[in-house]
């Protein structure tokens, strides 16, 4: 698993460097998570042909994974810092149950899956410090999440592989959109 942000050899070699700003730390954290997702996607795509065939193999996807929409204020047109930040935090909180599902779904990248999960928790904390309107952030219901997790884990092998692929793809897209939006803040 890659070394978490702030713990790489370059940081050790440059003790007099200015400490990272809050925005730089968030940016670095997201890029670190994206690297982790790339590694997990590599294992998933090597294991099966899910990555190329998901369009043809699926008629409908009702996983309800968080997605950026125009109304969320994260795109260049209609950009709204506060609304967007709430959406990013809410989306990441909603992704947590899916990241929990990803644990034990990888053979050679088990540590990587755990690193993505833990780094996302840290990212949420960073962003919550940045947000002014924490009241607008809705936390997913733990009972609903537990039920969702049980249903996801009850799927057959093929459906679980497809679910894994879809989660990783959606999480990557969500983080990339978040990164672009946060760079405008």
């Amino acid at each position: 698993a890659p070394v978490p942000p702030g713990e790489d050899s370059k940081d050790v070699a440059a003790p007099h460097r200015q400490p990272l700003t809050s925005s730089e730390r968030i940016d670095k954290q997201i890029r670190y998570i994206l690297d982790g997702i790339s590694a997990l996607r590599k294992e998933t795509c090597n294991k099966s042909n899910m990555c190329e065939s998901s369009k043809e193999a699926l008629a409908e996807n009702n996983l309800n994974l968080p997605k950026m929409a125009e109304k969320d204020g994260c795109f260049q047109s209609g950009f709204n810092e506060e609304t967007c930040l709430v959406k990013i935090i809410t989306g990441l909180l909603e992704f947590e149950v899916y990241l929990e599902y990803l644990q034990n779904r990888f053979e050679s990248s088990e540590e990587q899956a755990r690193a993505v999960q833990m780094s996302t928790k840290v990212l949420i904390q960073f962003l919550q410090k940045k947000a002014k309107n924490l009241d607008a952030i809705t936390t997913p219901d733990p009972t609903t999440n537990a039920s969702l997790l049980t249903k996801l884990q009850a799927q057959n092998q093929w459906l679980q592989d497809m679910t894994t692929h879809l989660i990783l793809r959606s999480f990557k897209e969500f983080l990339q959109s978040s990164l672009r939006a946060l760079r405008q803040m």
Epitope: A57, N62, K151
Partner: nanobody, 125 residues
Framework: EVQLVESGGGVVQPGGSLRLSCAAS????????MGWFRQAPGKEREFVST????????YYADSVKGRFTISRDNAKNTVYLQMNSLRPEDTALYYC??????????????????WGQGTLVTVSS
């Protein structure tokens, strides 16, 4: 555990119609995605049609689009395949399948958990 029993197959002339039924045992029928697949002699099994849990949306293979209609009656634990304008190339053993996924509606056999024994459809003049 779900048991699936197909019926409605038979011999029909080109251009004719048939309605296949698939009765499912089990109380949780409405939570299953239901699909129809077919296997012609000497060929691989292929996707025909699938319908989501609510019955609000059906999906079809290009070869049957506009001719076949899938529907379900959750109160009767039954899924139907209405086949119109039948062609000789529709001749096959038709299988009903159930997917306990709960989130995804698959077009491929690997996405389904339970299968019926099949009902034979022969289109011939």
């Amino acid at each position: 555990e779900v048991q699936l029993v197909e019926s409605g197959g038979g011999v029909v002339q080109p251009g004719g119609s048939l309605r296949l039924s698939c009765a499912a045992s089990g109380r949780t029928f409405s939570s299953y995605v239901m699909g129809w697949f077919r296997q012609a002699p000497g060929k691989e099994r292929e996707f025909v049609s699938t319908i989501n849990w609510a019955g609000s949306r059906g999906y079809y293979a290009d070869s049957v689009k506009g001719r076949f209609t899938i529907s379900r009656d959750n109160a009767k634990n039954t899924v139907y395949l209405q086949m119109n304008s039948l062609r000789p190339e529709d001749t096959a053993l038709y299988y009903c399948a159930a997917s306990a996924g709960g989130f995804l509606v698959p077009r491929v056999g690997q996405g389904y958990d339970y299968w019926g024994q099949g009902t034979l459809v022969t289109v011939s003049s």
